[in-house]
């Protein structure tokens, strides 16, 4: 499919001008290659009319130009003094006319309306309001006032001062007679339809002395604004419908076959399933405007979108609307990254988030999409030290591996963590990507004690058991804080005995804290990584208390200091449901009751072989 995009249809009137914008992927080659505008012949060729290399056909001499905007990835063709002869099929493109890097454009130039003398022209957008003013003389002040519409050869009564309203206008028309001082009446038509366009006649009086005034009403269908976005990127539609619809339900819909427009999202709570997890509708201040953000763009998202306002929350005749034509460029600069990441209850996930590598200094963010109301995405963590309170100790945003990717690690997973998350930066807003976390059956691979108490001034050793599947990975311990996880020295204690059916390649790696101080209290993570790519992690909260008796503490998984109501598994490991808690010192009081939805036998699942867009919690 050609990545060139422009308007499918351009309509104008004789004598007027048009400006046609064509979009292309702004690669280095594309920015500098030839741009052209050509007319398609009956036999399939395409005759160049104007190009960026200076050529201008004699047909366009003195009335057209082509300007390239390489920084935007667009070029613009302006054509003036249009005639009906300019109607036809054209292409805007890059390179050689026959190469296929082009977009088809239909140009329709119509004859201007033949208007009677003294005709007032009203040009109004679809769905809006028009006021037709009708002057009259004093002698007709007391006489009947009326508005007719010319249908074919005959005038048809639309409204009059005796109370008649044509059924086609019921509920959306009124006739106002100004105060005695002004010799004027006006007809106000709301929620204008395309069928309202045409020639009108207002009249005061019915005899030969009546006053008449011609009016021509043109109802404009909104020209779609062209929007060109990258596959996997995001788009924002800004919809400004005016203060008169500030309190009316708003919607965004996508046109399907014919005149149907399927609701994508509306303020009444409707949202199309295909947009679950990747759309926000944001009401704006005062004026009834709103914006809709869609992330994780797919090729099937391309098409014509309309936003509007109607009490039903969907497109109806007479809704004021705005239109966009969205083109999704499949030659995307946004790299593929997994759209689904799987983890097990009690385990962890490491999510890779792409960003524009030119913006390495930008602030990185991760938020949780919530579908309630119109959708919102509260921030969970950023690269400047913000961590949402409920996530302290189990969530970290790391700048690694860098060069266009950052990492978010979330551990102590529960079923409540399943959902959609957005990766964002404060640089190029189009780089918002969506990832879904799924909680699947299985057990965490890394095994650590549930909670640990250290004694001031003593030495503490905390074990982390790594199964043999991680034999080739780097193993580490780190201390969590709100800006990351600071690496700590650890000791390899040899093979672990914590795993059934696991050979000498399993490992027990311990963290040792010498001469414990109050500053050592907090969350510690053990984990695996390969270079700058992070895999699974497990978290332990270390509380610090006053010395009771001398000696050092060596914490094992099957330590007998389990709380009385903790469940000890057959294999001798304490199983703790790692709830995110606001005061980790309450951790010992937490009842470790297994959530049957979250805990299951069997090992972790990894990448689904059926999808290159999914990743397991520890794979990359």
């Amino acid at each position: 499919k050609s990545p060139i995009f422009g308007p499918e249809e351009v309509n104008s009137v004789e004598g007027n001008s048009v400006s046609i914008t064509c979009y292309y992927p702004p690669t280095s080659v594309n920015r500098h290659t030839r741009k052209y505008w050509c007319r398609q012949g009956a036999r399939g060729g395409c005759i160049t009319l104007i190009s960026s290399e200076g050529y201008v056909s004699s047909k366009y001499a003195g009335r057209a130009n082509l300007t390239n905007f390489p920084e935007n990835g667009t070029f613009v063709v302006n054509i003036a003094q249009l005639s009906q002869d300019d109607s036809g099929r054209y292409k805007c493109g890059l390179g050689i006319n026959s190469r296929g890097l082009s977009f088809d454009v239909s140009l329709e130039v119509s004859q201007g309306p033949g208007l009677l003398n003294d005709t007032k022209v009203y040009t109004v957008d679809l769905g809006r309001t028009v006021t037709i003013n009708c002057p009259f003389k004093t002698e007709n002040a007391q006489k009947r006032k009326s508005l007719y519409k010319q249908i074919g050869l005959y005038p048809v009564l639309v409204i009059d001062s005796s109370g008649y309203v044509n059924p086609n206008y019921t509920g959306r028309i009124r006739l106002d007679i100004q105060g005695t001082g002004q010799l004027l009446f006006s007809v106000v038509i709301n929620q204008l339809r395309l069928s309202d366009a045409g020639q009108y006649l207002c009249q005061a009086g019915d005899d030969s002395n009546s006053n008449k005034k011609n009016a021509d009403l043109q109802v404009l269908k909104p020209e779609p604004e062209l929007v060109y976005e990258d596959l996997r990127g995001s788009v924002t539609f800004h919809c400004a419908l005016g203060p008169e619809v500030a309190n009316v339900a708003k919607f965004l819909c996508r046109q399907s076959s014919g005149e149907n427009c399927d609701v994508v999202v509306n303020t009444l709570g409707k949202r199309a399933p295909a947009f679950e997890g990747r759309i926000l509708l944001n009401p704006q201040d005062k004026d009834g405007s709103f914006s809709v953000v869609i992330t994780g763009l797919r090729k099937e998202d391309a098409g014509r979108y309309l936003c509007g306002a109607h009490s039903d929350g969907q497109l109806q005749e007479g809704s004021p609307i705005q239109a966009w034509q969205l083109f999704v460029n499949e030659e995307s600069t946004i790299p593929r990254s997994p759209t689904v990441v799987k983890g097990v209850a009690g385990g962890s996930v490491a999510v890779l988030c792409p960003y524009n590598r030119k913006e390495s200094k930008s602030i990185k963010y991760w938020c949780l999409w919530e579908g309630a109301q119109n959708g919102r995405c509260p921030l969970l963590v950023d690269s400047e030290g913000w961590v949402k309170a409920q996530y302290e100790g189990r969530l970290s945003l790391l700048e690694e591996p860098g060069n266009g990717t950052f990492t978010v690690i979330l551990n102590q997973l529960t079923s409540r963590d399943a959902g959609f998350y957005w990766c964002l930066t404060n640089g190029d807003t189009l780089w918002r990507t969506t990832v879904e976390i799924k909680i699947i059956e299985g057990e965490p691979n890394l095994k650590v004690p549930g909670n640990v108490t250290a004694v001031l001034g003593e030495t503490l050793k905390v074990p982390c058991h790594f199964p043999c599947k991680f034999s080739s990975y780097e193993k580490y311990w780190c201390k969590w804080n709100n800006t990351g996880c600071q690496a700590l020295p650890s000791q390899d204690e040899g093979p672990s005995k914590a795993f059934v059916n696991c050979d000498e390649n399993s490992r027990l790696v311990s963290l040792t804290l010498n001469l414990v101080t109050r500053a050592d209290e907090g969350w510690y993570w053990c984990g695996v990584k390969q270079g700058h790519f992070y895999g699974e992690t497990a978290a332990v909260y270390v509380a610090v208390e006053e010395r009771k008796a001398a000696g050092s503490r060596d914490v094992s998984l099957a330590k007998a200091d389990a709380a009385p109501d903790e469940k000890v598994l057959d294999s001798g490991f304490r199983e703790i449901e790692n709830k995110a808690i606001q005061d980790p010192r309450l951790f010992a009081e937490e009842k470790a009751v297994a959530d049957t939805r979250d805990q299951a036998d069997g090992s972790r699942a990894s990448v689904d072989s059926g999808s290159s867009e999914e990743q397991g919690g520890s794979s990359r």
Epitope: N282, Q284, S291, C367, R376, C377, G385, N426
Partner: nanobody, 126 residues
Amino acid sequence: EVQLVESGGGLVQAGGSLRLSCAASGRSYAMGWFRQAPGKEREFAAAISWSGSRTYYADAVKGRFTISRDNAKNTVYLQMNSLKPEDTAVYYCAADPDGTVVASSGWTNSYEYGYWGQGTLVTVSS
């Protein structure tokens, strides 16, 4: 639930300065100042992110007003210099504890701020 209490408003002569403070009962990712002049709609004045690295200003106050925050005290400030009679308004402090402004790019949008103070009156006489 975040409670916000503004202070620092008062009467000042044109060209003078005032410093508004807003004390919050808990931490918030984004904090903002909005104002409402008599007979007018409430409008955005300034906003600041958690770290203070991102600040936003309405065109009408750019270069004259400075927003800052002290996270240790959960307080946000609005330093207003070169005040004009048209700055006369009730100034409201607003908080977005969840940081929803980031994904929506709604830093200037009152809908994004879930918590509001009672307001403090600033009167600039000519």
